[in-house]
Amino acid sequence: MMTGTIETTGNISAEKGGSIILQCHLSSTTAQVTQVNWEQQDQLLAICNADLGWHISPSFKDRVAPGPGLGLTLQSLTVNDTGEYFCIYHTYPDGAYTGRIFLEVLESSVAEHGARFQIP
């Protein structure tokens, strides 16, 4: 039975040209995390495998950095980066847990006045 829950940063906004950390956390389960996939809609951004470490998709290599932890840092943001991001935690023996984050990338002047959520 899958007892775990994924906590995410929820809906976040950031300004164009800046960077943002996408973070998920799996709790309430003793399952062992074997791999975390980060996806944007249907595109794979990155994989963090417990044994093999990080793999960043070639098309995102310049703008995506691994970490902190199992999170993902998006850099040089553009308005086109607005959208849904998913963290998929593959665990033994529970299977896969999925968390959702919505990122809105705003023009600098708008973002300065809008609420922003940043992970310390």
């Epitope: 039975m1 899958m2 003793t30 399952a31 062992q32 995390v33 074997t34 791999q35 495998n49 417990a50 044994d51 593959h90 033994y92 023996p93 529970d94 299977g95």
Partner: antibody
Framework: EVQLVQSGSELKKPGASVKVSCKAS????????MNWVRQAPGRGLEWMGW????????AYAQDFTERFVFSLDTSVTTAYLQISSLKAEDTAVYYC?????????????WGQGTLVTVSS | DIQLTQSPSFLSASVGDRVTITCRAS??????LAWYQQKPGKAPRVLIY???TLQSGVPSRFSGSESGTEFTLTISSLQPEDLATYYC?????????FGQGTKVEIK
């Protein structure tokens, strides 16, 4: 080369305790969940449970919740199975088996097995 | 808990025969099934995982298939070294479990 090397055969009296070791080499112990499997003489394979090698948290199958303890010593890359208050029906070969961290979690490497005989 | 029913429990076949072992799950388990071979006095070794994927180093005469909740291990041409007991295992949730085993004898 991945290897799981188990401790030697044990002959114990009813009521005694036994501790079976499983020494992992050729990979990082803490990246792969470890399972324990029992095989009584002339019988099939019985999954006893597993230990989260990252956190040290064990999970036991229904028939193995009382007298069985899974533990780890990561400093010597070894997993342990301890059985207390031994009974004649605990006579069996005990195997440790590593969970592959593919998406389907089969057991890709097994120890050679440890025969525990309980007899007065 | 999901139960696995393996059949037959015993079979005897000649070298070169095609051998089929079946494992039926009491509920859907997708492709979360593995097949193991255990030779007398030895530890099990994985043959097939994900219902159909051949483990590296395993001879190609072994294959796996699935149809709904029924899974099949096939040995296309039985060899003398295939004398063993074969087990299926469900992998998709706690608790894991094994089938009862199929002992394969060479005629």
């Amino acid at each position: 080369e991945v290897q799981l090397v188990q401790s030697g055969s044990e002959l114990k009296k009813p009521g005694a305790s036994v501790k079976v070791s499983c020494k992992a080499s050729g990979y990082t112990l803490t990246n792969y969940p470890m399972n324990w499997v029992r095989q009584a003489p002339g019988r099939g394979l019985e999954w006893m449970g597993w230990i989260n090698t990252n956190t040290g948290s064990p999970a036991y199958a229904q028939d193995f919740t009382e007298r069985f303890v899974f533990s780890l010593d990561t400093s010597v890359t070894t997993a342990y199975l301890q059985i207390s208050s031994l009974k004649a029906e605990d006579t069996a070969v005990y195997y440790c088996a590593r969970t592959a961290i593919t998406s389907v979690y089969h057991f890709d490497y097994w120890g050679q097995g440890t025969l525990v005989t309980v007899s007065s | 808990d999901i139960q696995l029913t393996q059949s037959p429990s015993f079979l005897s076949a000649s070298v070169g025969d095609r051998v089929t072992i079946t494992c039926r799950a009491s509920q859907g388990i997708s492709s979360y099934l593995a097949w193991y071979q255990q030779k007398p006095g030895k530890a099990p070794r994985v043959l097939i995982y994900g219902a159909t994927t051949l483990q590296s180093g395993v001879p190609s005469r072994f294959s796996g298939s699935e149809s709904g909740t029924e899974f099949t291990l096939t040995i296309s041409s039985l060899q003398p070294e295939d004398l063993a007991t074969y087990y299926c295992q469900k992998l998709n949730s706690h608790p894991s479990s094994f089938g009862q085993g199929t002992k394969v004898e060479i005629k």
